[in-house]
């Protein structure tokens, strides 16, 4: 039988609420027409529509359906941007403070080596803070030019006080010596397999957060294709073609189009699932060697007793060091005036004891729950993007791309859609080249975190022991001692409390040598302020 | 890239001397010393000495000490060693070697070999 | 005078892991040093400083050191790693050392 006559015989509310999308009315018919130069919304009778409207109507379609996919992904969005942020600066902020416990260190155990000891501290930590950026540095290179550049202060300033000038040629050779008799003992090994380690997870934790927030800016800027456009307008537009203003298409013809329009994208959901449980795995292993908080907060100890392990073979040393290094080859010495303070930042912080403590550890975990509530984005974005767009409840008396119906049938949709395109063929097309380019980053960034992670890739999990080292833990409680013994040593119990508000009560009494309480930046602290309900310390 | 390249083989008599040659390319002649290891017949590594191109300062295995002497032309870097007083034992290949850093140091490039055969 | 002591031999089966270990006193204050050398051919450096790598030396061999012990470790093993291996370290009382020597066969 032949359909009804559209109910508004003069394409009235069709030309107003056109008006809307597109001011002038001169493509809007104003009594409905035959349409046969129609593509999209196709009529069983006279219509409402001509060419440009469904033009207009296709170009709508995809603006409204990129604009749903953005609101679709804006939480998830948020919630890595604003951790990549947080952590980077974090992480920034627990190298300052390294930097300072070391330089602290120096100052009160070693007040002879500041001036060139700071300097070799300062651009130790600054290669640490580029690494973590992903900067090409080799973490052994670095450790071993910090000991290359110490020891020779250390054998003219504090085992050799005396040497003449003239015998401040064989730096050179000092360098050489420091590694060829191994004279900081192992400490050097250690630090280098505790730092690599810790850093290499750090490095790929901030490399993995910004590849999440890249696959969601990719997706959330996909360009829909011509074919998933008409289907879209079909859907949402061609109701209107023939007067059905107040008519909402069917949930479950909407959710085939989505799956139609959808396809490329819904291909990474095998592998943001593989991201989010292998990102967990990573963050579940962070912890002792493997924490940088934990490992670079504690350097300034382990130097501290590699200079120890030099003082107490000192006599040998100097007597080898005499043989080794006589007639040496000359280099110039660099010699400098640095002022005392100049490298100390006047920030070594106390350790906040919060009611509610907040370390980067748990603020690791915390996004790894947050991200898992995401872990099936991708495969879920079809119903999402139907859920949140305007469809007919329980699929009664709604629109199914060609008529009203009183139920949906999802074989008798297919059937009439047959003759206009096929929507098994728009899955078949397969991704978009932007997306296959980013599930190539997301196999790849996924590769990286199961070699890393420890329970599976046990890359990172030879036991220092192993390598001859004393490991240096201070056993499995949760006080984890990583300061040493000595003058002017401090316990850090349990990490910093950086997130509590960056907790920067100061109280010399317990950091390492500063000499004054200081203010921290308002920036610093205004990063954190959203990270929990925090009783802040701060006065 | 670093190349050391040793003279030929020589056959001496008990009691006479030997000279062996090391010319050095590849990098700064001066910066690295140059050890001289020898190697007999079937038998392992034994170190014979070493020289600073740099500052000519040389410093030799003790079971060597007045035997051997070991010099270094800087102009075309090359190094020397020579070994007085061959006994047959002294026979096998000589090696010249260059420091990695110190006197104390690794050896990160080897020449080729020369074979020394002491016989009557 | 230092006294550096290897096994003589080390036999091992293809793609399996070989251990040339290096024993002297207190040798893990020391800088231990590996070298290859394979029939007719000069030493190559294979391991420096106890466990670094020269650059052209696959990731297959590498080094540990601690107490009165040094390791030379080989895994994987391939038909081209069949050679003798020395370690070597220097000490200010006897200078430059070298171990006994270990011949590695890949059965």
């Known amino acids: 039988q032949p359909p009804p006559p559209p109910p508004d015989a003069t394409c009235h509310q069709v030309r107003s609420f056109f008006q809307r999308l597109q001011p002038g009315l001169k493509w809007v018919p104003e009594t409905p027409v035959p349409g046969s130069d129609l593509q999209v919304c196709l009529p069983k009778g006279p219509t409402c529509c001509s060419r440009k409207m469904e033009e207009k109507y296709q170009l709508t379609a995809r603006l409204n359906m990129e604009q749903l996919l953005q609101s679709a992904s804006m939480e998830l969005k948020f919630l890595i941007i604003q951790n990549a942020a947080v952590f980077q600066e974090a992480f920034e902020i627990v190298v300052r403070h390294a930097k300072n416990y070391t330089n602290a260190m120096f100052k009160n155990n070693y007040p002879s080596l500041t001036p060139q000891a700071f300097e070799f501290v300062g651009e130790f930590f600054t290669d640490v803070s580029l690494y973590i950026l992903g900067s090409d540095i080799n973490v052994d290179d670095m450790v071993n030019e910090l000991f290359d550049s110490l020891f020779p202060v250390i054998y003219t300033q504090l085992m050799n006080p005396g040497l003449p000038d003239s015998a401040l040629d064989i730096n050179e050779c000092l360098r050489g010596a420091r590694r060829d008799l191994k004279v900081f003992g192992n400490f050097p090994k250690l630090i280098m397999t505790q730092v690599s380690k810790s850093l290499q997870v750090t490095r790929i934790f901030l490399q993995a957060l910004n590849l999440g927030i890249e696959v969601i800016n990719t997706t959330d800027h996909l360009k829909f294709s011509k074919d998933c456009g008409r289907m879209l307008t079909r859907m949402w537009y061609c109701s209107y073609c023939q007067g059905l203003m107040m008519v909402k298409p069917c949930g479950g013809y909407c959710n085939v189009v989505m799956q139609g329009c959808m396809a490329g994208v819904v291909e990474i959901d095998k592998y943001w699932r593989e991201y989010i449980l292998s990102l967990e795995e990573l963050v579940n292993g962070m912890y002792r060697i493997y924490d940088m908080e934990n490992v670079l907060l504690g350097l300034f100890s382990t130097i501290h007793d590699s200079i120890q392990y030099v003082q107490k073979n000192a006599g040998k040393l100097t007597t080898t060091i005499g043989k080794l290094c006589a007639h040496s080859q000359q280099r110039q010495y660099r010699s400098a005036y640095y002022p005392e303070d100049l490298f100390i930042d006047k920030k070594v912080l106390k350790v906040a004891h919060v009611e509610h403590e907040e370390t980067l550890s748990s603020r690791r975990r915390e996004l790894i729950q947050k991200l898992k509530s995401f872990i099936s984005f991708y495969s879920a974005l079809p119903g999402y993007i139907c859920s949140h767009s305007p469809v007919a409840e329980n699929d009664t008396l709604c629109w199914n791309g060609q008529e009203l119906v009183e139920r949906y049938s999802q074989k008798a949709a297919r059937n009439g859609m047959k003759n206009q395109f096929n929507l098994h063929e728009l899955k078949m097309k397969g991704p978009e080249p932007v997306v296959s380019q980013i599930i190539d980053k997301l196999k790849h960034i996924n590769q990286l975190l199961r070699t890393m992670s420890m329970p599976k890739g046990r890359v990172l999990d030879k036991n220092l022991d192993e390598e001859g080292f004393e490991s240096g833990d201070c056993g499995d409680d949760e006080d984890e001692c990583i300061g040493g013994s000595g003058d002017g040593m401090i316990k850090v119990k349990n990490q910093l409390r950086f997130l509590a508000e960056l907790a920067y009560d100061l109280d010399v009494d317990d950091a390492p040598g500063n000499s004054q309480q200081a203010t921290p930046k308002d920036n610093e602290i205004s990063t954190f302020h959203n990270l929990g309900n925090v009783h802040s310390p701060l006065k | 890239q670093v190349q050391l390249v040793q003279s030929g083989a020589d056959v001496r008599k008990p009691g006479a001397s030997v000279k062996v040659s090391c010319k050095a390319s590849?990098?700064?002649?001066?910066?690295?010393?140059i050890s001289w290891v020898r190697q007999a017949p079937g038998q392992g590594l034994e170190w014979l000495g070493w020289?600073?191109?740099?500052?000519?300062?040389?410093n030799y295995a003790q079971k060597f000490q007045g035997r051997v002497t070991m010099a270094t032309d800087t102009s075309t870097s090359t190094a020397y060693m020579e070994l007085r007083s061959l006994r047959s034992d002294d026979t096998a290949i000589y090696y010249c070697?260059?420091?990695?850093?110190?006197?104390?140091?690794?050896?990160?490039?080897w020449g080729q070999g020369t074979l020394v055969t002491v016989s009557s | 005078q230092s006294v550096l002591t290897q096994p003589p031999s080390v036999s091992v089966a293809p793609g399996k892991t070989a251990r040339i270990t290096c024993g002297g006193n207190?040798?893990?204050?020391?800088?231990v040093h590996w070298y290859q050398q394979k029939p007719g051919q000069a030493p190559v450096l294979v391991v420096y400083?106890?466990?670094d790598r020269p650059s052209g030396i696959p990731e297959r061999f590498s080094g540990s050191n601690s107490g009165n012990t040094a390791t030379l470790t080989i895994s994987r093993v391939e038909a081209g790693d069949e050679a003798d291996y020395y370690c070597?370290?220097?000490?200010?009382?006897?200078?430059?050392?070298f171990g006994t020597g270990t011949k590695v066969t890949v059965l």
């Open positions: 070697a260059r420091g990695k850093r110190t006197l104390a140091s690794c050896f990160d490039y």
């Open positions: 590849g990098y700064t002649f001066a910066s690295h010393g």
């Open positions: 020289i600073s191109p740099y500052t000519g300062n040389t």
């Open positions: 207190n040798i893990g204050s020391k800088s």
């Open positions: 400083d106890d466990s």
């Open positions: 070597q370290v220097w000490d200010s009382s006897s200078d430059h050392v």
